[in-house]
Amino acid sequence: MSSKYPRSVRRCLPLWALTLEAALILLFYFFTHYDASLEDQKGLVASYQVGQDLTVMAAIGLGFLTSSFRRHSWSSVAFNLFMLALGVQWAILLDGFLSQFPSGKVVITLFSIRLATMSALSVLISVDAVLGKVNLAQLVVMVLVEVTALGNLRMVISNIFNTDYHMNMMHIYVFAAYFGLSVAWCLPKPLPEGTEDKDQTATIPSLSAMLGALFLWMFWPSFNSALLRSPIERKNAVFNTYYAVAVSVVTAISGSSLAHPQGKISKTYVHSAVLAGGVAVGTSCHLIPSPWLAMVLGLVAGLISVGGAKYLPGCCNRVLGIPHSSIMGYNFSLLGLLGEIIYIVLLVLDTVGAGNGMIGFQVLLSIGELSLAIVIALMSGLLTGLLLNLKIWKAPHEAKYFDDQVFWKFPHLAVGF
């Protein structure tokens, strides 16, 4: 097995990626400028910390979380970084074009970088379902399509349903999950004989995946509060997210032990279930009025996540060709739905408490918003999957799925690992 990049990809990837980067640089040159009105530099430097937290989540958290494959850990981390870097650039431009362009220039602020990082995070969640089965050229396509689809979804939801930044960005969990699952469904599924070991996890990569989970766990409150507009809402979001993820860790570890006949704890369950509370609480994190509610939500989310990790991989592996350790897709799809349902319940309580008959209308709109997110995710995911199947991308052969040696130079290694 040659450790060289296939010839065609070696020709295609640098040309494709560098041409795209040159195009992005030109777009930035002609259409963007920095916000020049920085009166209070000290305050703005402080607000950069939220953006920094998001970058840590994306680069280290999601980068390492997806690195548990025995023979695909390098690619997981580095490809994640590549997608993040590309995704942020395109997301800044796209958000600017969609929201500011009538004025002729896109003004880049710390907030626009924050938004762009969160948009790029969507791709990093989705890609968990396809990592190891695609090359970098294909991932570039996935980044461009998904960031574009999410940007347009957010714009449509904002205009039709009158939602703010936080609300329309919190559809990211459901959107990213369904996008990733629909892309995975389009890709070639069967693993030929003799390659099954490659999608198994190994101890050291699993440890790095746990490190990724820890980073995500630590910074999830920043993610859920990043787009909220007032200190009191942010405070609520941080507290509720913290309580939810704290309880989901306890639930994940004990639930994982409970689910095993010998009472052993599964690394895979824990990797994803520790984050369950943060996903489930995301949409309504600023609204939940007391800690016990956030904790109950964390408990329920942890149980759903462990249950899902136990019973869904078989189905996902058969139908979508997603390996057992890539459980972020179905995990986020279930937990994202749970979060949306909780929000709808809170909306109903608010309407009932206000004492008028608008409940059906409010619920209908919320369901419409959620349905739109899922439909756009599925449609754009299927479109991406079809695009990725085109011969021009020279996708890795099924026999070379989940193999770092297809993409990386390992001077100290022989042909095999």
Epitope: S47, T109, F111, N162, R229, E233, L346, D350, A354
Partner: antibody, heavy 125, light 106 residues
């Protein structure tokens, strides 16, 4: 006592620039979103711009996008509105307003609970 | 969301019950505020979150509604209530105001 005091208004020619200030006192300025709202002679109120409590984000009405810039200096408890390429239709009384966020039954609600007295900007040749 | 107020103007007597309506083009939940504006003064907040009375506002003012239809009611009109009344949505940017209802005392 909460006070908002606008200044910097006056008569200016079309195409020129003007900078409005709003000095805040009596509350913790750095924890509130601040807005500019205007009222043209004989017309209704029109929202102009907002800046978030930490200055990280700004939003503008379509009519002023690309020409007006809102900013704040939390260390000086001051809000600003830089108005460039002024037009006759920008003639109005400009108010700064504080946005307070309050809990409804469950959802959060936003209200302009304090306003300044306004400063008149006249764009005329 | 565009806000349409009605009526454009109205004239009523002291002691009358007056109702002003505001209709939104989109669902704005309960994020609607009502202001009273007198010439030469700053606008004054009367009702926020559709039905909550702002501190210091007389109890004759009340608000109701949710979603797209809202009303401001003055239960017993007083001479000092002569002013222009605006509704305003604060759910999403750009914030918008209704065109105003001018209330005169007969």
């Amino acid at each position: 006592e909460v006070q908002l005091l606008e200044s910097g208004g006056g008569v200016v020619q079309p195409g020129r620039s003007l900078r409005l200030s709003c000095a805040a006192s009596g509350f913790t300025f750095s924890t509130y979103g601040m807005h500019w709202v205007r009222q043209a002679p004989g017309k209704g109120l029109e929202w102009v711009a907002v800046i978030w409590f930490d200055g990280s984000n700004k939003e503008y009405a379509d009519s002023v996008k690309g020409r007006f810039t809102v900013s704040r200096d939390n260390s000086k408890n001051t809000l600003y509105l830089q108005m460039n390429s002024l037009r006759a239709e920008d003639t109005a009384v400009y108010y700064c307003a504080r946005e307070e966020v309050v809990r409804g039954v469950i959802l959060w609600s936003r209200k302009f609970d304090y306003w300044g007295q306004g400063t008149l900007v006249t764009v005329s040749s | 969301a565009e806000l349409t107020q009605s009526p454009f103007s109205l004239s009523a007597s002291v002691g009358d019950r007056v109702t002003i309506t505001c209709r939104a083009s989109h669902n704005i939940y309960r994020s609607l505020n009502w202001f009273q504006h007198k010439p030469g003064e700053a606008p004054k907040l009367l009702v926020y979150a559709a039905s909550s009375l702002q501190r210091g506002v007389p109890t004759r003012f009340s608000g109701s509604g949710s979603g797209t239809d809202f009303t401001l009611t003055i239960s017993s009109l007083q001479p000092e209530d002569s002013a222009t009344y605006f509704c305003q949505q604060s759910v999403t940017f750009p914030y918008t105001f209704g065109q105003g209802t001018k209330l005169e005392i007969r």
